[in-house]
């Protein structure tokens, strides 16, 4: 069986809230991921949870990788096994998953100074929506390789996926709705696949006329013999996924093909605000791999509206302001902690702030509510003091950032926080200061003297 792994470990894990974190979509059946290690003389290749398949389609740099290796170090024309999967994926905390590979072979590598090679890959769920990043080598010593990979696949699956054609819940941080792409009245999209025609009807339960009541969302018809009709994915078996900047609709559970696999279809959506067909666009067949049929589809309905699309800056006439220098994205960065001199050490509250983004759930802020942009932590727990919902504004010579819709604070009200950012040239280090809190704990005000609040430039025009 060409798909059978030599070495493989479980590639998903459940967190304490029983939410599934699933790295299976990252597993490569052929080829491998190149790790960014800023050293042109060596290349480190990895697969996720299973070995690099060097027998099937071995790439030129991977040809020499020993069987079973999931981490292969290539130096010149030589390749070395520096790690094989041993233990399954581990959750080290809510936003971090760890995979460990060790070299099982007894013989030591001469460049490892007597140490046994090992690879640790830490998958980090980013604090905001972002495109995929390459796995990065963060430390290397005596053949111990530490890799960090910031990817949304490390986030819990409810954040990434939906069984419907929309992603718009609180969970998901985005607003996507593909339901307008559904065709009614028995019509369907047609995509030319050289020797086949594909009929598609997405986001609905409309029978495709050609498809013999197969409940197909994607139907494959042989051009030379139109009686040969196969379901290439059924509308009951649908997953919409938005991860690492990629929007994908998957239909599985189609008719079996000769290899024994069930046919499935993967539709890769791209945002195109000028798509034809009233913005709907049309699917284009791009190829088939192992009974999986791939399509790309340019449509305005794939233009993802993100909460993070809110501008992290402000304009005032021709003056531009940009607060993005203050944004904390992912570890090893840390949240800003506000200075609060008003309380004794015993009743001390810690105020954690991020700009234009949720606070990072690290350190004392680990228990903060997931979507809080400002969070207060004391001995009783944590509180959401406001979410990033509206863009910064220019007000009275300063930049005003208002975070709203925090935790309930009584009388049907929610906590709100104002941050006033005051221009202080050359200072990007100073922390915000708590100025006031009032209205029965419903309102907080911080002041922040920072270079990020200084005018950036005059806009052209």
């Amino acid at each position: 069986d060409i798909f059978k792994a030599n070495k493989e470990v479980p590639c998903y894990v459940f967190d304490e809230e029983l939410r599934k974190h699933d790295l299976n979509p990252l597993i490569k059946l052929s080829g491998a991921y190149l790790v960014d290690d800023s050293d042109p003389d060596t290349s480190l290749f990895i697969n996720v949870c299973r070995d690099i398949d060097t027998l099937r389609d071995p790439g030129s740099q991977l040809r020499a990788c020993p069987p079973g290796t999931a981490a292969c170090l290539v130096r010149g024309h030589q390749a070395f096994d520096v790690g094989q999967p041993r233990d399954g994926l581990k959750l080290v905390r809510k936003d971090r998953l760890v995979l460990s590979y060790v070299r099982e072979e007894a013989g030591k590598l001469d460049f490892c100074d007597g140490h046994s090679p090992a690879v640790t890959i830490t998958f980090v769920c980013p604090s905001e929506r972002r495109e995929g990043t390459i796995p990065k080598l963060t430390a290397k010593s005596n053949c111990r390789y530490e890799i960090e990979w910031i990817t949304e696949y490390a986030c819990h699956r409810d954040y990434l996926e939906s069984k419907t054609c929309s992603l718009s819940g609180e969970q998901q941080d985005v607003s996507i709705d593909l339901t307008p792409l559904a065709q009614s009245g028995g019509s369907s999209y047609i995509s030319d696949g050289k020797e086949y025609l594909f009929y598609l009807n997405v986001c609905g339960e409309t029978e495709i006329q050609f498809c013999n009541k197969k409940q197909a969302a994607v139907c494959q018809v042989k051009k030379s013999d139109t009686s040969q009709v196969k379901a290439a994915g059924r509308y009951h078996n649908q997953t919409l996924r938005y991860s690492d900047g990629d929007l994908t609709l998957i239909y599985f559970g189609g008719d079996e093909c000769s290899s024994g696999f069930q046919r499935m279809s993967v539709i890769n959506f791209e945002c195109n605000k000028t798509a034809g067909n009233d913005g709907k666009g049309t699917p284009v067949f791009t190829g088939e791999v192992d009974c999986t049929y791939f399509f790309t589809w340019d449509t305005e309905y794939a233009c993802v509206k993100e909460k993070e699309d809110l501008l992290c800056g402000a304009t005032d006439g021709k003056k531009r302001y940009d607060l993005s220098a203050l944004v904390r994205h992912a570890e090893p960065e840390q949240n800003w902690e506000a200075v609060d001199g008003s309380q004794t050490e015993t009743e001390k509250k810690h105020f954690f702030i991020n700009i234009c983004h949720r606070v990072l759930q690290e350190g004392k802020a680990r228990g903060c509510p997931e979507d809080a942009a400002v969070c207060a932590v004391d001995k009783n727990g944590s509180k959401n003091l406001g979410k990033f919902i509206s863009s910064p504004m220019k007000e009275k010579g300063n930049i005003q950032l208002s975070y709203s819709d925090g935790d309930d604070c009584g009388h049907g009200k929610k906590i709100k926080t104002n941050i006033t950012l005051v221009c202080k040239p050359g200072d990007l280090e100073s922390a915000p200061v708590l100025r006031t809190s009032g209205e029965g704990g419903c309102f907080y005000e911080f002041e922040w003297h920072t270079a990020a609040a200084c005018v950036l430039s005059k806009t052209e025009g």
């Epitope: 080829g31 190149l34 389609d57 991977l62 995929g132 390459i134 993967v266 890769n268 791209e270």
Partner: nanobody, 128 residues
Framework: QVQLQESGGGLVQPGGSLRLSCTAS????????IGWFRQAPGKGREGVSC????????YYHDSAKGRFSISRDNAKNTVYLQMNSLKPEDTAVYYC?????????????????????WGQGTQVTVSS
């Protein structure tokens, strides 16, 4: 067996030209996207240009626009990167890479993450 072999690198003076070749074997040539990448000492690998062998679609990184040109010769299963007006900052090891076009989002074809197979690289040095 998928194999990628780069050639054509060397030492060239600023303002000079070089043509790199990436010859592929072991796979259905027109089912792949071929990308050119480079890696300078101490830096990460970055995308330069890419080409969909099937339909001829092309993409360039901003740093390559107007100076570099990617092309293909289907009879020879080869993709070329013609580099003109070379600058010292173009000094790097240049790699070609391949990925099956079926699953590739072509607009992301300058992303290292997307590629499955890599060549060994060829050194380009721009110096007077």
């Amino acid at each position: 067996q998928v194999q990628l072999q780069e050639s054509g690198g060397g030492l060239v003076q600023p303002g000079g030209s070089l043509r790199l070749s990436c010859t592929a074997s072991g796979f259905t040539w027109d089912s792949y996207v071929i990308g050119w990448f480079r890696q300078a000492p101490g830096k990460g690998r970055e995308g330069v240009s890419c080409l969909d062998v099937d339909d001829g679609s092309i993409y360039y990184h901003d740093s390559a626009k107007g100076r570099f040109s990617i092309s293909r010769d289907n009879a020879k299963n080869t993709v070329y990167l013609q580099m003109n007006s070379l600058k010292p900052e173009d000094t790097a090891v240049y790699y070609c890479a391949a990925v099956n076009r079926a699953s590739m989002r072509f607009r992301r074809c300058l992303q290292v993450l997307r590629y499955d197979y890599w060549g060994q690289g060829t050194q380009v040095t721009v110096s007077s």
